[in-house]
Interface confidence: low
C-alpha cells in the first residue's frame, strides 16, 4: 500500500567465509531524503522500547560520520534510491537476516535481506538438457549463486580431469534481480563421451579449486562397430570361401536388429554377426559392411572391400576420336575388367600386333590415313591373358589426294572447240562431294567431276580443279594449249616515219598480236593481186602508181587472217598538166572561151599561175580562165603552173586561135 | 634372327650416283618400318631416309632432301637408297636399320637392328 | 633440330667400377601425352655395328645386362654402367627419337685403364 517504503534486492544472498558479499540494492522512501541509516544483524523489536535490538554493524548519522570499526561492511547507497551494500571479508557468523532500518524525517522502515554464509565454498550447480545425442551440439550450463566485486572467481571445465578445449562463455550477474556466476560450454558430444564424467570446478582468481560439481554424460548412440574379415586383406579367388564377422563395441541404448550390406544394398537372410560367403564369384567382389540399429538409429561398420581376383574378361578399345582428321592426335584405350588390374596389354592394328605398346592406352600424336582400320587389344594380369574383344575402328578422314586435271580431247585443241576436261584424285576420306573449277566461267558441268567449254576461247589457258569433300584440294593448272589463227593482223608502215613522198624508199609491216602455232607465213595483195610472201613490203622508189589498197594475210596451220585494208598513199608535185579549150581551140571573136589547167596531183593542187606566149604571168589563179568576150588578140600560146605542197609542174603551150567574126570581116 | 645385309658399295667421284640395296630377313619385312642411317669417318651417326612399312610416308634429313630416294619392294624383302649428285661429305659408312617395331606413329623412332655397314666414297 | 651433347668425350675406368656418362638436349625430350622420354642409347664396339641398349630413356632393349641402367628426364640424361667389365670397351651414343630429324650425340669413348 502507500504506506510502504518500496525495496528492491536479491531475497537471499550466499557466500562463504572469507570471501565477500555485495547486495545491490534501491528503495524509494515515502516521502523526504534519508536522514538515518542502521544495519542490523538479526533485528528484534523492543516493543518495551519500540526500537529494534541487535548487532549493530553499520550505522550512519545526520553529520555522515561513521566509525572507523565499521569499515568492513560499507553502505554504497544515497539519500534517495540507492542501498547498496558491501561485506568484505564475510565471516561464518554473518549468516542470518540483515536488517536495514531507514530514517527519514517523518517515517521510518526495517527492511530484511537473508545472507547465507557457508564455512566453505559451496559448489556451482552443473545443468545438462534432458538428452543428449552424439554428434549434436548442446550447452553445458554451471552456474553459482554468488557474485561479489571484491572476490574474482573462475569456472572451468574439465572432462575426465581435463580441461576442455571448448571456449566457455562466462557471464556474473550482480542487480537487485539475482546475483550469479554462470559459465556456459557449447559442445558435441561423441559416442566415445558417454559415461565420461564432467567437471565444473570453482577457482579463485590464482586458479586455487574451492569446490566442484560434477556429472557424468549419457550420450545416446547408435551402435558402434568392427568388422573382422578372414581372410584378412580380403583379397580372394574365385571359389575360395569368406566370413566376416561384425562386433558391437558400443550402443546407448541396447541394439536390436542386425543385417549385414554389399555397395548399400541389404544382403537378404543375413541377420547374424556372421556372414559367410562359400565359393566366392567376381560378382560377390564389392564393399560389405554390417548394420546395427538402436532406439537412435542404425549404425554401420567401415566397409570391407572384398576382391575376388579374375582373369582379364574379353576387351573392347574406346578410340578419342574417330573419325579423325589426318595431322590430329588420337588415344585409344584398352577397356577389360579384371582384379588385378592387368599389368600387361597387346595392341592389334588390323589383326597384326603392335610392336612396343604394352599400356592401357596408346597414343598418336599426328594421325596419318594408313592409321585407318580396326584397333583390338588383349588385357593380361597374374591369372591369365583376355580375349581379343571385337575391336574399334578408327576412321581417318583427310582432304582428296593427288588431284590432278585431265584433258579428255585430242590434242592438239583448236579455238572453236568443245573441250572436256576431267577432275581426277587418288583417295579421299569422306567421299568428294563437289568439285571447284579455276578460272570461274559460264562453262556446263555435264558430271560431277567433269567440265565441258564450249567455243574454247583462244585465251584460255589454264584451268585447274579442286575436288572437295570437307576440305577442297587443288590440282596443279593444266595448259589448254589452244591453237588458234593469227589475231589481230594490221599493216604498219615502218619507213619513212612521216608521209610517202614520190620516190621515197617505203616498207610496210605485216603485224599480228599472237598466233598458235606460232609457224606463220604471210601473203601481201593489192587489187587482187599477190605482190609478196614476206612479213614487209619494199618500195625502193615509190611512185604515185603504187598508191592504193593493201591488205597482208597472216596463216598458220590452223587458218588465216586478213589485216584490213590499208591505203598506200603517195604525195607528189602536179605533173601531167595539159591546157584544154572549150568550146575548142578556134574560137570566133566575141564568144566565149575557157582554158583549164588540168594536172595530176597529190595532195591536189593549191595554187594555179597563167601564163600567154611571152612567159608573161597573167592575174588569175584559179584552175580555169575564162575570156568573154574573147578577142583576137588574145590568140597565142597559153600554159599554166600547178604548185602543190610538194612543188609544182608546168603545162606545154596551148595556142587558141580568135578568129574574126562575119560582122568585123563584113566591116573590113 | 634379325638380318639386314647392305651392299652397293663404292668409290664415287662427286656429282656421281650409286644406288644401295639391304636385304633383309628373319622377319616380317613388309610390317616394318625402314630407315638409312650413316657414320662419318669422325665416327659421327647420322639419320639419313625414312620409309613407313606400307611406303606411304617418307622422311628424309635436310642434307640429303632432293638427292636420295629411298624405297622398298616388299615382294623382295629389299630396301633400297639411291643417291644422286654425290658430294664428298656423303662419304660415310651407310647403315640399313630396321625401326623398332611396324608401327609407331608413323615417324622414325630407335633403331632395334643393324645391318654391318656399306662403305660409300665420294672423291675426285 | 635438336642438338644432343654427350659427356665427358672419353673416359678410361678399371673393370669393376661404376660408369656414369651424359647427354643433355637442347630441349625437352618429354612427351606430354605419354610421359615418357623420347630418348635412346646404343652401344658400338670396335668394328661393329651399333647396338640399342636402351629407348625411352630408361627401358632396357631385351637381352641387354641389367648393369646398364638409363635414367634422366626432360634434357638432362644418364646412362649408368654398374661394375664395368672388359667386353663394355664401346663407344656409347645417344639419340633423341622425339622429332624428325633424328640426331645422335658425338659419343662416349670408353677405354679400360
Known amino acids: 500500500d502507500s504506506s510502504k517504503w518500496v525495496f528492491e534486492h536479491p531475497e537471499t544472498l550466499y557466500a562463504w567465509e572469507g570471501a565477500c558479499v555485495w547486495i545491490p540494492c534501491t528503495y524509494r522512501a515515502l516521502d523526504g531524503d534519508l536522514e538515518s541509516f542502521i544495519l542490523f544483524h538479526n533485528p528484534e523489536y523492543n516493543k518495551n522500547t519500540s526500537k529494534f535490538d541487535g548487532t549493530r554493524l553499520y550505522e550512519s548519522t545526520k553529520d555522515g560520520k561513521v566509525p572507523s570499526e565499521q569499515k568492513r561492511v560499507q553502505f554504497l547507497g544515497d539519500k534517495n534510491k540507492n542501498c547498496t551494500l558491501s561485506i568484505h571479508p564475510v565471516h561464518l557468523n554473518d549468516s542470518g537476516q540483515l536488517g536495514l532500518r531507514m530514517e527519514s524525517k517523518t517515517e521510518k522502515w526495517m527492511e530484511r535481506i537473508h545472507l547465507n554464509v557457508s564455512e566453505r565454498p559451496f559448489p556451482p550447480h552443473i545443468q545438462l538438457p534432458p538428452e543428449i545425442q552424439e554428434s549434436q551440439e548442446v550447452t553445458l550450463t554451471c552456474l553459482l549463486n554468488f557474485s561479489c566485486y571484491g572476490y574474482p572467481i573462475q569456472l572451468q571445465w574439465l572432462l575426465e580431469g581435463v580441461p576442455m578445449r571448448q571456449a566457455a562463455v562466462t557471464s556474473t550477474s550482480l542487480t537487485i534481480k539475482s546475483v550469479f556466476t554462470r559459465s556456459e560450454l557449447k559442445f558435441s558430444p561423441q559416442w566415445s563421451h558417454h559415461g565420461k564424467i564432467v567437471t565444473c570446478q570453482l577457482q579463485d582468481a590464482d586458479g586455487k579449486f574451492l569446490s566442484n560439481d560434477t556429472v557424468q554424460l549419457n550420450v545416446k548412440h547408435t551402435p558402434k562397430l568392427e568388422i573382422k574379415v578372414t581372410p584378412s586383406d580380403a583379397i580372394v579367388r574365385e571359389g575360395d570361401s569368406v566370413t566376416m564377422t561384425c562386433e558391437v563395441s558400443s550402443s546407448n541404448p541396447e541394439y536390436t536388429t542386425v543385417s549385414w550390406l554389399k555397395d548399400g544394398t541389404s544382403l537378404k537372410k543375413q541377420n547374424t554377426f556372421t556372414l559367410n560367403l562359400r565359393e566366392v564369384t567376381k560378382d560377390q567382389s564389392g564393399k560389405y559392411c554390417c548394420q546395427v540399429s538402436n532406439d537412435v538409429g542404425p549404425g554401420r561398420s567401415e566397409e570391407v572391400f572384398l576382391q575376388v581376383q579374375y582373369a582379364p574378361e574379353p576387351s573392347t578399345v574406346q578410340i578419342l576420336h574417330s573419325p579423325a582428321v589426318e595431322g590430329s592426335q588420337v588415344e585409344f584405350l584398352c577397356m577389360s575388367l579384371a582384379n588385378p588390374l592387368p599389368t600387361n596389354y597387346t595392341w592389334y592394328h588390323n589383326g597384326k600386333e603392335m610392336q612396343g605398346r604394352t599400356e592401357e592406352k596408346v597414343h598418336i600424336p599426328k594421325i596419318l590415313p594408313w592409321h585407318a582400320g580396326t584397333y583390338s587389344c588383349v588385357a593380361e594380369n597374374i591369372l591369365g591373358t583376355g580375349q581379343r574383344g571385337p575391336g574399334a575402328e578408327l576412321d581417318v578422314q583427310y582432304p582428296p589426294k593427288k588431284v590432278t586435271t585431265v584433258i579428255q580431247n585430242p590434242m592438239p585443241i583448236r579455238e572453236g572447240d568443245t573441250v572436256t576436261l576431267s577432275c581426277n584424285y587418288n583417295s579421299s576420306n569422306p567421299s568428294v562431294t563437289r568439285y571447284e573449277w579455276k578460272p570461274h566461267g559460264a562453262w556446263e558441268e555435264p558430271s560431277l567431276g567433269v567440265l565441258k567449254i564450249q567455243n574454247v576461247g583462244w585465251d584460255n589457258t589454264t584451268i585447274a580443279c579442286a575436288a572437295c569433300n570437307s576440305w577442297c584440294s587443288w590440282a596443279s593448272p593444266v595448259a589448254l594449249n589452244v591453237q588458234y589463227a593469227p589475231r589481230d593482223v594490221r599493216v604498219r608502215k615502218i619507213k619513212p616515219l612521216s608521209e610517202i613522198h614520190s620516190g621515197n624508199s617505203v616498207s610496210l609491216q605485216c603485224d599480228f598480236s599472237s598466233s598458235h602455232p606460232k609457224e606463220v607465213q604471210f601473203f601481201w595483195e593489192k587489187n587482187g593481186r599477190l605482190l609478196g610472201k614476206e612479213s614487209q613490203l619494199n618500195f625502193d622508189s615509190i611512185s604515185p602508181e603504187d598508191a592504193g589498197s593493201y591488205s597482208c594475210w597472216v596463216n598458220n596451220s590452223i587458218g588465216q587472217t586478213a589485216s584490213k585494208a590499208w591505203t598506200l598513199e603517195v604525195l607528189y608535185a602536179p605533173r601531167r598538166l595539159r591546157v584544154s579549150m572549150s568550146p575548142g581551140d578556134q574560137v570566133m571573136e566575141g564568144k566565149s572561151a575557157t582554158l583549164t589547167c588540168e594536172s595530176d596531183a597529190n595532195p591536189p593542187v593549191s595554187h594555179y599561175t597563167w601564163f600567154d606566149w611571152n612567159n608573161q604571168s597573167l592575174p588569175y589563179h584559179s584552175q580555169k580562165l575564162r575570156l568573154e568576150p574573147v578577142k583576137v588578140q588574145h590568140s597565142g600560146a597559153y600554159w599554166c603552173q600547178g604548185t602543190n605542197s610538194v612543188g609544182k609542174g608546168r603545162s606545154p603551150l596551148s595556142t587558141l586561135t580568135v578568129y574574126y567574126s562575119p560582122e568585123t570581116i563584113g566591116r573590113r | 634372327d634379325v638380318k639386314l645385309v647392305e651392299s652397293g658399295e663404292g668409290l664415287v667421284k662427286p656429282g656421281g650416283s650409286l644406288k644401295l640395296s639391304c636385304a633383309a630377313s628373319?622377319?616380317?619385312?613388309?610390317?616394318?618400318?625402314m630407315s638409312w642411317v650413316r657414320q662419318t669417318p669422325e665416327k659421327r651417326l647420322e639419320w639419313v631416309a625414312y620409309i613407313t612399312s606400307g611406303g606411304d610416308y617418307i622422311y628424309y634429313a635436310d642434307t640429303v632432301k632432293g638427292r636420295f630416294t629411298i624405297s622398298r619392294d616388299d615382294a623382295r624383302n629389299t630396301l633400297y637408297l639411291q643417291m644422286s649428285s654425290l658430294k664428298s661429305e656423303d662419304t660415310a659408312m651407310y647403315y640399313c636399320?630396321?625401326?623398332?617395331?611396324?608401327?609407331?606413329?608413323?615417324?622414325?623412332?630407335?633403331?632395334?637392328?643393324w645391318g654391318q655397314g656399306t662403305l660409300v666414297t665420294v672423291s675426285a | 633440330d635438336i642438338v644432343m651433347i654427350q659427356s665427358p668425350s672419353s673416359l678410361a675406368m678399371s673393370v669393376g667400377q661404376k660408369v656414369t656418362m651424359r647427354c643433355k638436349s637442347s630441349?625437352?625430350?618429354?612427351?606430354?601425352?605419354?610421359?615418357?622420354?623420347?630418348l635412346a642409347w646404343y652401344q658400338q664396339k670396335p668394328g661393329q655395328s651399333p647396338k640399342l641398349l636402351v629407348y625411352f630413356a630408361s627401358t632396357r632393349e631385351s637381352g641387354v645386362p641389367d648393369r646398364f641402367i638409363g635414367s634422366g628426364s626432360g634434357t638432362d640424361f644418364t646412362l649408368t654402367i654398374n661394375s664395368v667389365q672388359a667386353e663394355d670397351l664401346a663407344d656409347y651414343f645417344c639419340q633423341q627419337h622425339y622429332s624428325t630429324p633424328l640426331t645422335f650425340g658425338a659419343g662416349t669413348k670408353l677405354e679400360l685403364k
Open positions: 628373319g622377319f616380317t619385312f613388309s610390317s616394318y618400318a
Open positions: 636399320t630396321r625401326d623398332q617395331g611396324y608401327y609407331y606413329d608413323g615417324r622414325p623412332t630407335w633403331f632395334a637392328y
Open positions: 630441349q625437352s625430350l618429354l612427351s606430354s601425352s605419354n610421359q615418357k622420354n623420347y
